[in-house]
């Protein structure tokens, strides 16, 4: 999906209002320096591409993020503020339902969510205006 035509400011508002709090809840008890951030993004569409990938794509050691509250709210925000996003996700959603039976918080998942926090921070405040 090409995130170029999303309403970035509306997505930012959704993040600041709710998603950020859910990420904090997920990460509670984890030190901010515990993980090295290896994923970065260069502009807002790229940030959303990386956020989508880390949030919804299963990775080795972390297959359960898609059912978390922050993930569901992220999906809702993208569906509302990115034209045509919902249609591209129908097949992916079916695959996720088969792949994810339960929510398990692993160290790998905590690391992944730490990366997500950095990506969201970058998305919200790109230094060069990327509208």
């Amino acid at each position: 999906y090409d995130f170029t035509n999303c309403d970035f400011e509306k997505i930012k508002a959704a993040y600041l209002s709710t998603i950020s709090k859910d990420l904090i809840t997920y990460m509670s008890g984890t030190k901010s320096t515990e993980f090295n951030n290896t994923v970065s993004c260069s502009n807002r569409p790229h940030c959303l591409t990386e956020i989508q990938s880390l949030t919804f794509n299963p990775t080795a050691g972390c297959a359960s993020l898609a059912k978390e509250m922050f993930a569901m709210k992220t999906k809702a925000a993208l569906a509302i503020w990115c034209p045509g996003y919902s249609e591209t996700q129908i097949n992916a959603t079916q695959a996720m339902k088969k792949a994810r039976k339960s929510k398990v918080t692993t160290n790998k998942c905590l690391e992944q969510v730490s990366q997500l926090q950095g990506l969201w921070r970058r998305f919200n405040r790109p230094l060069l205006k990327q509208q």
Partner: antibody, heavy 120, light 111 residues
């Protein structure tokens, strides 16, 4: 503990340059925008610019764009501000500051400040 | 650039009384229903300290006698019951539009 520690006070001659450092600890330096703010005697706060350590991208206040250069050294989690062609009105306390956790655009952690005095 | 104008420039209030500082922006600092206006307190020889973020949210560790309100172009910082340690200069700051700008500051003293 999250903190920013700046280099010590500097006395410089007009026309010279100064480079102020800001060492970060207690957080993932590469993912936070780092800002620089000027506070001249008897004046208000003035934003100089910001840098994103992840890729070195910068944003400057046009007033400082020609004379201020912001850089980072990710290996030591240190941000730098170099100010060239110094003049008397550059006499001020310079602060580095970390932008908040969420990208809201406020500064939640500040360095202790570095006093730069420009005098002949 | 968005110009932030604070009023008054200085203010003297009795201990225990209410102090109110205003900040007017030359254009709206709102975006998608959120107001990107922040308030800081600065005491002599110290760096600024965040008091209020996004117009009305209390910063970490800030006493609840401090509050913020407003939207669009007009914002207010209120100290409900002035304490001796509140003597400082107070600044508003916007980040909705680059470049980031501060108000000129309001000096708060004890009457």
């Amino acid at each position: 503990e999250v903190q920013l520690v700046q280099s010590g006070a500097e006395v410089k001659k007009p026309g010279s340059s100064v480079k102020v450092s800001c060492k970060a600890s207690g957080f993932t330096f590469s993912t936070y925008n780092m800002h620089w703010v000027k506070h001249a005697p008897g004046q208000g706060l003035e934003w100089i610019g910001a840098i994103y350590p992840g890729n070195g991208e910068t944003s400057y206040n046009q007033k400082f764009k020609d004379r201020a250069t912001l850089t980072v050294d990710k290996s030591t989690s240190t941000a730098y501000m170099e100010l060239s062609s110094l003049r008397s009105e550059d006499t001020a306390v310079y602060y580095c500051a970390r932008e908040d956790d969420y990208g809201e655009g406020y500064f939640d952690v500040w360095g202790q400040g570095t006093t730069v005095t420009v005098s002949s | 650039d968005i110009v932030l104008t604070q009023s008054p420039d200085s203010l003297a209030v009795s201990l225990g009384e209410r102090a109110t500082i205003n900040c007017r922006a030359s254009e709206s600092v709102d975006n998608s229903g959120l107001s990107f206006m922040h308030w800081y307190q600065q005491k002599p020889g110290q760096p600024p300290k965040l008091l209020i973020y996004r117009a009305s949210n209390l910063g970490s560790g800030v006493p609840d006698r401090f509050s913020g309100s407003g939207s669009g172009t007009d914002f207010t910082l209120t100290i409900s019951s002035l304490q001796a340690e509140d003597v400082a200069v107070y600044y508003c700051q916007q980040i909705n539009t680059d470049p980031l700008t501060f108000g000129q500051g309001t000096k708060l003293e004890i009457k």
